[in-house]
């Protein structure tokens, strides 16, 4: 058993059929001696006296909120909750697995630039008696700070017969040093709390891996005279990190027809403009990606050709 | 070329190269066989390996100031990768493709380590750590954390060159 | 589909040098490791070596004079040697594949059926 | 050498119930994260076959009643509901160094 917060502590359990499960001892905070009652939520069911109160926890029922009293008094609280194990193995059924870019993968994070600001979201289909809390450092050993702000609720969204909830939260490196090489990654660590179930999740990540940035922006197009050709140009986006002599980015050029199955004409450049066929019909995209490090490429930014 | 007393490296040279590292040490990644273990393998390898680190003057301002220090970071990275990649970690069992761009890699770390040192010229290098895998599979799981980190570091080796050789160059 | 079969004498004199061979199919030596596991009646597994890709061996020191183990990968054969046979030799010689470096980390996915060799005069 | 202790000896479990064996290491069998253990099952008169590789992952075509866990020099291998068909002998291997090294191995029946 630990403590979460303030009275409110997490019994660990092993989950399985006719498990001995774990004995608690709960002391009433309190300089009262005698006299002192406790029960369990709403109940006035007393399930003992004295200071302290033993008991065995092994399922559910036997989590909630102890309140210890005297004479129709309330004295302190204890809320439990429970964190199962199966064969080895903490439970995660509060959040979804968005198995992207691999399995048993439960919070996401994407960076825009190299400034130590990140995001994270995550997934689920509960949507009452639900709360997040995230913490986040780099490194373990040794924490560097990382301040996060309150996880919200960002967007709902119908999948099939159910309702999915996403929840993002931000986060920001308190020193953050966007031209050295990462050697410790960021570590954030989400609680998660539905009804008397506790459950955390985890990522680990250096923030050179996560980057994705925004589209380019002012994408433009310049007929060339007597061609079918143009010239296609744009702007770094004005997220991405500076100066952009430093943090440079390449960009993919490409030019769509109207089908999907018409087939894309692609050009790779690290400058900001390009010279394409402009087909009738067509739309030209342009899209992102660090330079010199191949994570992940930004959206597309787009343009019709006519 | 970077001589230690403070003449300025040829910045361009060591941007075309230093990015054709960057290409080479992503195309090395996948190819060095197939690899479930690096999901795993959650331990860092690289703690020993020299990190360019935000005192080292690899910054904007801090290469205007004086980028000897961040020039010298770099060579120091390059030699002590140039040994890795030589070592039985690459060269053991399991063998490496005959064509595979670690061969290349090797040598570009090398080339663009003499053009930061010309011949003469002694800054000193780190210890190449002891990673001592015994077996087969542990090397495979070294090669891959390697490169991962080899290619953190080249990265920023090549911001260097990049911004040295818009901003600084003669 | 992946097999391994050993085959050798059945019964060996004391001082004497058996020699085991392993045939493969369904996959090649030159991806795959092959180990040489034995155990004696009623006892645990002991590794005694192992042959790989490349063709460099790693033996168990306790046997390791003894023990010698080449392929012939054109052949998909493994062949264990072992001098000086003793009555505590006697045990089931297994032909075993290394899984794939890359994800079973020396873990030994597939096995023969074994070979039951027996050391006495 | 890597001595590998298994525990306990023989195990008597009623069908359907959890059987739980442990293996312990006398040294660390982790190698940068990645834990080097491995389970097999054996019948009589049958080789060895793969239950459980790197500590927790399950063999293809294995069922999924059998489970892995531990790192380090402590691992469990449960069978959460035994079967007729999982009466054997269990034992863990390890590939950490040379030589790899079997535990003595677990007997599993029915009670």
């Known amino acids: 058993i630990w403590e979460l917060k303030k009275d409110v502590y997490v019994v660990e359990l092993d989950w399985y059929p006719d498990a001995p499960g774990e004995m608690v001892v709960l002391t009433c905070d309190t300089p009262e001696e005698d006299g002192i009652t406790w029960t369990l939520d709403q109940s006035s069911e007393v399930l003992g006296s004295g200071k302290t109160l033993t008991i065995q926890v092994k399922e559910f029922g036997d989590a909630g909120q102890y309140t210890c009293h005297k004479g129709g008094e309330v004295l302190s609280h204890s809320l439990l909750l429970l964190h199962k194990k199966e064969d080895g193995i903490w439970s995660t059924d509060i959040l979804k697995d968005q198995k992207e870019p691999k399995n048993k993968t439960f919070l996401r994070c994407e960076a825009k630039n190299y400034s130590g600001r990140f995001t994270c979201w995550w997934l689920t289909t509960i949507s009452t008696d639900l709360t997040f809390s995230v913490k986040s450092s780099r490194g373990s050993s040794d924490p560097q700070g990382v301040t996060c702000g309150a996880a919200t609720l960002s967007a709902e969204r119908v999948r099939g017969d159910n309702k999915e909830y996403e929840y993002s939260v931000e986060c920001q490196e308190d020193s953050a040093c966007p031209a050295a090489e990462e050697s410790l990654p960021i570590e954030v660590m989400v609680d998660a709390v539905h009804k008397l179930k506790y459950e955390n999740y985890t990522s680990s990540f250096f923030i050179r891996d996560i980057i994705k940035p925004d589209p380019p922006k002012n994408l433009q197009l310049k007929p060339l005279k007597n061609s079918r050709q143009v010239e296609v140009s744009w702007e770094y986006p004005d997220t991405w990190s500076t100066p952009h002599s430093y943090f440079s980015l390449t960009f993919c050029v490409q030019v769509q027809g109207k089908s999907k199955r018409e087939k894309k004409d692609r050009v790779f450049t690290d400058k900001t403009s390009a010279t394409v066929i402009c087909r009738k019909n067509a739309s030209i995209s342009v899209r992102a990606q660090d330079r010199y490090y191949s994570s992940s490429w930004s959206e597309w930014a787009s343009v019709p050709c006519s | 070329r970077a001589v230690p007393g403070g003449s300025s490296p040829a910045w361009t040279q060591c941007q075309q190269l230093s990015q054709k590292l960057c290409t080479l040490a992503w195309s090395a990644h996948p190819l060095v066989g197939h690899m479930d273990l690096r999901e795993e393998g959650d331990e860092e390898t690289t703690n020993d390996v020299p990190h360019i680190q935000c005192g080292d003057g690899c910054d904007p301002q801090g290469l205007r100031d004086n980028s000897q220090f961040c020039l010298q970071r770099i060579h120091q990275g390059l030699i002590f990768y140039e040994k890795l990649l030589g070592s039985d970690i690459f060269t053991g069992e399991p063998s490496l493709l005959p064509d595979s761009p670690v061969g290349q890699l090797h040598a570009s770390l090398l080339g663009l380590s003499q053009l930061l040192q010309p011949e003469g010229h002694h800054w000193e290098t780190q210890q190449i750590p002891s990673l001592s895998p015994s077996q087969p599979w542990q090397r495979l799981l070294l090669r891959f954390k390697i490169l991962r980190s080899l290619q953190a570091f080249v990265a920023v080796a090549a911001r260097v060159f990049a911004h040295g050789a818009a901003t600084l160059s003669p | 589909e992946v097999t391994l079969k050993e085959s050798g004498p059945v019964l060996v004199k004391p001082t004497e040098t058996l020699t085991l061979t392993c045939t493969v199919s369904?996959?090649?030596?030159?991806?795959?490791?092959i180990s040489w596991i034995r155990q004696p009646p009623g006892k645990a597994l002991e590794w005694l070596g192992v042959i790989w890709t490349g063709g460099g061996t790693n033996y168990n020191s306790g046997i390791k004079s003894r023990l010698t183990i080449s392929k012939d990968t054109s052949k998909s054969q493994v062949v264990l040697t072992m001098t000086n046979m003793d009555p505590v030799d006697t045990a089931t010689y297994y032909c075993?594949?290394?899984?794939?470096?890359?994800?079973?980390?020396?873990?030994?996915?597939?096995w023969g059926q074994g070979t039951t060799v027996t050391v006495s005069s | 050498d890597i001595v590998l202790t298994q525990s306990p000896d023989s195990l008597a479990v009623s069908l359907g119930e959890r059987a739980t064996i442990n293996c312990r290491a006398s040294?660390?069998?982790?190698?940068?994260?990645?834990?080097?253990m491995h389970w097999f099952q054996q019948k009589p008169g049958q080789p060895p076959k793969l239950l459980i590789y790197r500590a927790s992952n399950l063999e293809s075509g294995i069922p999924d009643r059998f489970s892995g866990s531990g790192s380090r020099t402590d691992f469990t291998l449960t069978i959460s509901s035994l079967q007729a068909e999982d009466v054997a002998v269990y034992y863990c291997?390890?590939?950490?160094?040379?030589?790899?090294?079997f535990g003595g191995g677990t007997k599993v029946e029915i009670k």
């Open positions: 040294e660390s069998v982790d190698y940068y994260g990645i834990s080097s």
């Open positions: 369904g996959f090649s030596l030159s991806s795959y490791a």
């Open positions: 291997q390890q590939a950490n160094k040379d030589p790899y090294t």
């Open positions: 075993v594949r290394e899984g794939d470096y890359g994800s079973y980390a020396g873990a030994m996915d597939y």
